[in-house]
């Protein structure tokens, strides 16, 4: 059997890292058993069989030109075998950051906080971590380890599937290399990373009869729980073409009436979403939808009993009295106020 | 030489922006992370953002975070801050530094100064 | 965020004196500690890392020791070129985090 172990990484291939001794072992031979070495390719001897270092070669101070194969022969002249040395650094800790969109499941994705030059691979796992009663500052022995599974195809991410809500997880991302290994730990809790994706199906159609009006629509984002036991709340901005600021509410439902918009020109609506207790996030903005307010006035129809019945809108005049709409980012004077006139409602 | 050099500090009014650079030589700058470290006059030292060797990775301190924007470009071997929305606050000699394993940082530049200030 | 702390903010000794600083961190940090010295006008200087190992090029005369969440910095003999601020930093989370600093002059 070879006296060399096998560090992992390709067969044959041998590692050390710059400026540091680098010990070559002849694969072949019995250990102990005096060899001679040579560069491939080259007469020059390097290191005889009466170096007293039996089947091992040192490189004193390793630099790249170093770098290559090796053939080590015994004392008959036969071949003990080729060795390749490669040089590169001990891995580092990676580094580490999770999310979730959901409050189910969440993901991990890591990067190498310097590059080792060597072959690499990183093992994944988590535990869970649980509070020891709900005065207990105390953490209880943690549960697990559980592998965190690795995409396929290579990409540096790992899922965590059925994780629970309230509870904190350890996050385990190991890089190894020939020459070592180096351990990043994370501590995430599911309420501080999640972050849903933004909502889908956004629409913006026009109110028939008020120049003034827009209604916004959206869907809960597919990969939020079918069931969700969380509601998401929402967040709406909009804003005229070529208006530079953005006007900001924040919706009951899933739709908003828009009642302060421009009369006659486009207006780009977007909406973002977070879980309605507030954990972790608000959504990226979802694309941008676009609606123009009618231009028409309301029928005069009578309208069927118990129906709502609205006055038609009329442009304000500038000094006219207006309450401001809730905003987080209110518009100039121009859009900051809402219909002069108020709809005011009544049973026919 | 292995060394690193800022660039870009200078005066500039509160609510602007400007953009510092950072050449690296003398070392294989993609294979490292880079960070940026500031020192307000008379002050201590304060991390301020790391990018990890693809870019593939950022870090902000709570303080820049939304306003500042690191970034590198392996081929140039630069490292680069974009800062925006510039506060009196900011006000610092700027320090590009190469860590290692994230956090040690071992090579450091000489500083750009940049003052915020009507 | 770790929040590092250092004493004292400020000491005179006579050369040759032993120095020590203190560094405190507001959890455990394993032993990621590195120990910095600054120059008036010059960047800092890594002395120590990983709590008791010397920089290449650092004189022999300056230490480190400790782990968790207490660490302390020790300059054997302090000498004239000692003068200098110095700083502890942690590394064990994605955000290194700096102590006050402790400003060493001679009496």
């Known amino acids: 059997s070879s006296p060399c172990p096998q560090a992992w990484g390709p067969p044959g291939v041998q590692y050390g890292q710059p400026g540091r001794s680098v010990k070559l072992c002849c694969p072949g031979v019995t250990a102990g058993d005096p060899v001679s070495w040579f560069r491939d390719g080259e007469p020059k001897l390097l290191q005889g069989p009466d170096s007293g270092l039996g089947h091992e070669l040192v490189l004193a101070q390793a630099d790249s030109t170093d770098e290559g194969t090796y053939i080590c022969q015994t004392l008959d002249g036969a071949l003990g075998g080729t060795v390749t040395l490669q040089l590169g650094y001990p891995p580092a800790r990676p580094v580490v950051s999770c999310q979730a969109a959901d409050y189910e499941n969440f993901s991990c994705t890591w990067s190498p906080s310097q590059i080792s030059g060597l072959p690499t691979r990183y093992l994944t796992s988590y535990r869970k971590k649980t509070v020891l009663g709900a005065d207990s500052q105390r953490r209880s022995p943690s549960t697990g380890p559980w592998p965190c599974p690795q995409d396929p195809l290579g990409a540096a991410r790992c899922v965590v599937h059925g994780a629970e809500f309230w509870s904190q997880y350890r996050i385990n991302v190991t890089e190894v290399n020939p020459l070592g290994a180096s351990t990043r730990l994370l501590d995430v809790s599911l309420q501080s990373i999640l972050r849903p994706d933004p909502p889908q199906g956004l629409r913006v159609e026009s109110v028939p009869g008020y120049p003034r009006r827009l209604r916004a629509s959206w869907t809960y984002p597919a990969s939020w729980p079918c069931q969700p036991h969380f509601l998401l709340k929402f967040r709406l901005q909009y804003r005229p073409a070529q208006h530079p600021a953005w006007s900001t509410v924040e919706p009951a439902g899933l739709e908003e009436v828009i009642t302060d918009a421009v009369a006659g020109l486009p207006h780009a609506v977007r909406v973002s979403a977070r879980d309605f207790l507030d954990a972790g996030t608000w959504s990226t903005w979802s694309p941008e939808a676009w609606g123009t307010p009618s231009t028409g006035t309301i029928p005069k129809e009578i309208p069927a009993w118990g129906q709502l019945h609205t006055q038609p809108e009329v442009e304000p005049q500038v000094d006219s009295p207006a309450p401001p709409r809730p905003s987080l980012q209110p518009h100039p004077r121009l859009l900051d106020h809402r219909d002069s006139v108020e709809q005011v409602a009544v049973l026919a | 030489e292995v060394q690193l050099l800022e660039s870009g500090g200078g005066l500039v009014q509160p609510g602007g922006s400007l953009r510092l650079s950072c050449a690296a030589s003398?070392?294989?700058?993609?294979?490292?992370?880079m960070t940026w470290v500031r020192q307000a006059p008379g002050k201590g030292l304060e991390w301020v953002s790391s990018?990890?060797?693809?870019?593939?990775?950022?870090q902000y301190a709570d303080s820049v975070k939304g306003r500042f924007t690191i970034s590198r470009d392996n081929s140039k071997n630069t490292l680069y801050l974009q800062m925006n929305s510039l506060r009196a606050e900011d006000t610092a000699v700027y320090y590009c530094?190469?860590?290692?394993?994230?956090?040690?940082?071992?090579?450091w530049g000489r500083g750009t100064l940049v003052t915020v200030s009507s | 965020d770790i929040q590092m702390t250092q004493s004292p903010s400020s000491l005179s000794a006579s050369v040759g004196d032993r120095v020590t600083i203190t560094c405190q961190a507001s959890q455990d940090i394993n032993n990621y500690l590195n120990w910095y010295q600054q120059k008036p006008g010059k960047a800092p200087k890594l002395l120590i890392y990983d709590a008791s190992n010397l920089q290449t090029g650092v004189p022999s005369r300056f230490s480190g020791s400790g782990s968790g969440t207490d660490f302390t910095f020790t300059i054997s003999s302090l000498q004239p070129e000692d003068i200098a601020t110095y700083y502890c930093q942690q590394y064990d989370n994605l955000s290194p985090t700096f102590g006050p600093g402790t400003k060493v002059d001679i009496k």
């Open positions: 990018i990890v060797p693809s870019g593939g990775h950022t």
């Open positions: 530094a190469k860590p290692l394993d994230w956090g040690r940082f071992d090579l």
């Open positions: 003398g070392f294989t700058f993609s294979w490292y992370s």
